[in-house]
């Protein structure tokens, strides 16, 4: 399966929407900066098959969807932008699910890299813990928004490789 061109466009639109969502200057939140330990190794795409890479991307997008569809998130971000954001994430999840179905039976390796999925979940668990610790303050959400933008940018490299990979 080759991810469609529309998937890359959707990823770019997601980044643009997230950029528009920013309400406060990141400079006013410097004291709240935090290292969430983004699992870069899971997105290098060297150590696993295509189906496994797709499952890792799917997990990241699903967790992002979960994070931004909470009550606390709805109270923080512009509703119109959030709806656009959900639409783009939903589109990407559908693309990846369609791709995963095509990969069934194509490779001998398992469709899921369990370690990688769990690692991505722990990454989002740290983000949720941070928000709770910071009582979902505007600055905490700003730090999280910047972090998710960064993680989407980094995962875009893997998505591009998947789009080109035979």
């Amino acid at each position: 399966c080759d991810l469609p061109q529309t998937h890359s466009l959707s990823n770019r639109r997601t980044l643009m929407i997230m950029a528009q969502m920013g309400r406060i200057s990141p400079f006013s939140c410097l004291k709240d900066r935090h290292d969430f330990g983004f699992p870069q190794e899971e997105f290098d795409g060297n150590q696993f098959q295509k189906a496994q890479a797709i499952s890792v991307l799917h997990e990241m997008i699903q967790q992002t969807f979960n994070l931004f569809s909470t009550k606390d998130s709805s109270a923080t971000w512009d509703e119109t932008l959030l709806d656009k954001f959900y639409t783009e994430l939903y589109q990407q999840l559908n693309d990846l699910e369609a791709c995963m179905m095509q990969e069934v039976g194509v490779e001998d390796t398992p469709l899921m890299n369990v370690d990688s999925i769990l690692t991505v979940r722990k990454y989002f668990q740290r983000i949720t813990l941070y928000l709770t610790e910071k009582k979902y303050s505007p600055c905490a959400w700003e730090v999280v928004r910047a972090e998710i933008m960064r993680s989407f940018s980094l995962s875009a490299n893997l998505q591009e490789r998947l789009r080109r990979k035979e």
Epitope: Q52, L118, Y130
Partner: antibody, heavy 122, light 107 residues
């Protein structure tokens, strides 16, 4: 009884290579992440590398990245570390360690081997 | 990387004394801070995980507290067998980092 037994340590010249092994027993090896932690004689502890329960996720300390490679064989309950381009600063006791979870981070190192000494010297 | 700072580097106390060791991290690690004991010539042993969870078989005189960036290991009544080095370690993100250690001696 849960046990971790390291082997493969010894004297090696700078620039040389060495492969350490660790055989696990007494617990379900394939269910836990594993790590290597080292300790230079008379010094503190330094985490070296971790591998997820299925061998899929691998993490390295900046000081060893690109030189060391961690791997595991779940069918033989064995953890490995391949160490290349060794320098004198790699001289240490190397401990094989079981983690409390299936993947690295947000857990603890709850079981340690007795350690194997690696000496890098001319 | 998260820096872990432990203090004091060494201490000497009498049997029965209350002893505290402090550990600070350069950013919040929530509760993901672990404590280890290493007796001379032995491998380390996990005493406390997740800031305050005592491992099975560890005497109840050991306790851990704290969250975020500040943590404390307390030995309520020091015993001769507690003569050892103690290390804290953040398990929040890789690379895992350890404190430099505290050597506890019995007077």
């Amino acid at each position: 009884e849960m046990q971790l037994m390291e082997s493969g340590g010894g004297l090696v010249q700078p620039g040389g290579s060495l492969r350490l092994s660790c055989v696990a027993s007494g617990f379900t090896f394939k269910s836990f992440a594993m790590s290597w932690v080292r300790q230079a004689p008379g010094k503190g502890l330094e985490w070296v590398a971790s591998v997820g329960s299925q061998g899929g996720s691998k993490y390295y300390a900046p000081s060893v990245k690109g030189r060391f490679s961690i791997s595991r064989d779940n069918s033989n309950n064995t953890l490995y570390v391949q160490m290349n381009s060794l320098g004198v600063e790699d001289t240490a006791f190397y401990y094989c360690v079981k983690e409390t979870d299936a993947v690295a981070t947000m857990d603890a190192l709850d079981m340690w081997g007795q350690g194997t000494l690696v000496i890098v010297s001319t | 990387d998260i820096r872990v700072t432990q203090s004091p580097s060494s201490l000497s106390a009498s049997v029965g004394d209350r002893v505290s060791i402090s550990c600070q991290t350069s950013q919040s690690v929530n509760i993901y801070l672990n404590w280890y004991q290493q007796r001379p010539g032995k491998g380390p042993q996990l005493l406390i995980s997740a800031a305050s969870t005592l491992q099975s078989g560890v005497p109840s005189r050991f306790s851990g507290s704290g969250s975020g960036t500040d943590f404390i290991l307390t030995i309520i009544s020091l015993q001769p067998e507690d003569s050892a080095s103690y290390y804290c370690q953040q398990g929040y993100i890789t690379p895992y980092t350890f404190g430099q250690g505290t050597k506890v001696e019995i007077k």
